[in-house]
């Protein structure tokens, strides 16, 4: 168990043309707050895909009104950390997305309005236990830096807080095969649930379900002695009483490396082979800058010769995000029809036909219903030797298998303006309008029945979060 | 055609408790998002709380904390359960509906409630 913490240090304008309109104004002040989702492993998920490694909401920032005529500058930012606590262990890869969200604080009924400003997304690999690691990432025109770390919460230790610390029994040392807890050396490791039979007095874990033997026993349980003619000791003295020892603590052990960082033993010592964006001996220091080589397949690095200076990484084709580290997919254009699995060979698109179709995008429908199901819980309907599914909530297209679009069916009442969000769908109401649909007018002309939008006003023009 | 019929309106006294009743002729009603407003004598009328169809809530700033909005959709009702009632929420009260279907709103004919020692 332990805490991701991330700290913003600023979120405004980013370096370069275009810079964004100030979101607060005389008539309208308002204030940021940030959202962070957390998902573990490096694999390119859906933005719509949950929070498994946690989320958190920040407290928000000052209020903030701009001032006529001068430049937009960094927003007033709220206290304080962002803890997400994880109660497994740290997988040591992640994604994130960082959400900057402005609470508009006009006079308007039923309390403050809110809308979605930048939202930043990225894969990283993170030890716990290391140092603050620093970031800085671009939407649009805006650009948000921050810095963020992964601890352990005790008694759990180690870089994926895996490993567990309990306060010494005896003021000396600690029991067989339970090593002191550094940094916390007044406390010792406590015994895991080692493998079932594992012995008491020669055996000891350091994962789950593992036995590891202490010095002069071996066996799966470690309830066998070492006999002295079969030893042979890479590191560590002999010992005449016990015949040959366990290795000794090598320089790797316990992995020096921070953030990441691979170690390898040398001869005097060790080496840390470090992730892009870290440096030092033991990978501790973080401050992407060009040189650090930020920018992954191909892309081109530009600007940022220190490291409180911006970096901008121009994509190859093919790939996109702040690092380059995004494959474009060709096959989210869903070229291929009636359910064919898309794949995306670099050179070329190929279309998988499911049973019962052809064609290079599956367009040829070579039966009906007969050995066929529809997806998702839908179900077939037979007719003029073609087949229909009639999908579940949620799913649509021919066979049910794509996600149905949420804003498709326009779920926003009143003009609202409709958003896919990661925890679903958003509407931004347009002024005059309340409700997660935006379905209640907040003062009605009388009964009568309203115009969708009031005299005016284009539809979903003010982007309203209610 | 979507017909509400409210009740529960009356005279309490200041910081007393009320709960105003709206049943719904359509027996869809949790496909309905339905609100309570209420017109006080002179001044236009107001969105008191709203529940969505998918049952999220939304009150105005004067009344949350003290006024409750709840659907049965067996009953094919809302409530507003109205407590540490102020003089300033005398009102005739009237029930709402925005039928997702027709995308049309829907009035009942309302409720007086009047606060006053």
């Known amino acids: 168990a332990g805490v991701f913490e991330l700290q913003i240090h600023s979120f405004g304008p980013g370096p370069g043309p275009g810079a964004p309109r100030s979101p607060c104004s005389a008539r309208l002040p308002c204030r940021l707050f940030f959202r962070v989702c957390l998902k573990p492993g490096l694999s390119e998920e859906a933005a719509e895909s949950p929070c498994a490694l946690g989320a958190a909401l920040s407290a928000r920032g000052p209020v903030y009104t701009e001032q006529p005529g001068a430049p937009a500058p960094d927003l007033p930012l709220p206290d304080g950390l962002l803890q997400v606590p994880f109660r497994d262990a740290w997988p040591g890869t992640f994604s994130f997305i960082i959400e900057t969200w402005r609470e508009e604080l006009g006079d308007q009924i039923g309390g403050p309005a809110w809308s979605l400003l930048a939202r930043v997304a990225g894969r990283r690999r993170l030890a716990a236990g290391g140092p603050w690691a620093r970031d800085i990432q671009r939407a649009g025109a805006w650009e948000l830096r921050f810095s963020y770390r992964a601890r352990c919460e005790p008694p759990a230790v180690g870089t994926a807080c895996t490993r567990l610390c309990r306060p010494r029994s005896a003021p000396s040392r600690c029991g067989p095969g339970l090593r002191p807890c550094a940094p916390l050396e007044d406390e010792c490791e406590a015994p895991l649930v080692c493998r079932a039979g594992c012995s008491p007095e020669h055996g000891f874990c350091e994962q789950p379900g593992e036995c590891r033997c202490l010095e002069g026993w071996t066996g799966p349980l470690c309830t066998v002695p070492v006999s002295t003619s079969s030893c042979l000791s890479p590191r560590g003295p002999s010992s005449a009483t016990t015949g040959c020892l366990v290795p000794g603590p090598g320089p790797c052990d316990g992995n020096p490396c921070a953030n990441g960082g691979s170690c390898s033993e040398t001869p005097r010592s060790f080496e840390c082979t470090c992730p892009r964006g870290f440096y030092g001996l033991r990978c501790e220091v973080s401050g992407v800058t060009c040189a650090d080589g930020p920018c992954f397949n191909g892309g081109l690095c530009v600007g940022g010769a220190d490291p409180d200076s911006a970096y901008i990484c121009h994509c190859p084709p093919g790939f996109q995000g702040s690092n380059c580290e995004k494959r474009v997919d060709r096959c989210s254009l869903q070229p291929c029809r009636n359910g064919g699995l898309c794949l995306d060979l670099g050179h070329a698109l190929r279309c998988r036909c499911r049973a019962g179709f052809a064609g290079p995008r599956c367009e040829h429908d070579l039966d009906d219903c007969a050995g066929r199901a529809c997806a998702n819980g839908g179900t077939c309907v037979e007719g003029g030797g073609a087949h229909r599914c009639s999908c579940a909530l949620g799913f649509g297209g021919r066979d049910c298998r794509e996600r149905a679009d949420p804003c498709a069916a326009r779920p926003c009442a009143h003009g609202g303006r409709c958003y896919a969000h990661f925890s679903g769908l958003v509407c931004a109401c347009a002024p005059g309008y309340m409700g997660a649909r935006c379905e209640f007018p907040v003062h009605p002309d009388g009964a009568s029945a309203l115009p969708a939008a009031p005299p005016g006003l284009r539809p979903g023009d003010p982007q309203r979060y209610l | 055609e979507v017909q509400l019929v409210e009740s529960g309106g009356g005279l309490v006294q200041p910081g007393g408790s009320l709960t105003l009743s709206c049943a719904a002729s359509?027996?869809?009603?949790?496909?309905?998002?339905m609100a309570w407003y209420r017109q006080a004598p002179g001044k236009k009328r107001e969105l008191v709380a709203g529940?969505?169809?998918?049952?999220?809530?939304t009150y105005m700033e004067s009344v949350k904390g003290r006024f409750t909005i709840s659907r049965d959709n067996a009953k094919n009702s809302v409530y507003l359960q109205m407590n540490s009632l102020r003089a300033e929420d005398t009102a005739v009260y009237y029930c709402?509906?925005?039928?997702?279907?027709?995308?049309?709103?829907?009035w009942g004919q309302g409720t007086l409630v009047t606060v006053s020692s």
């Open positions: 359509d027996s869809v009603v949790k496909f309905l998002s």
């Open positions: 529940i969505s169809a998918n049952g999220s809530r």
């Open positions: 709402y509906a925005y039928r997702w279907a027709t995308r049309l709103p829907y």
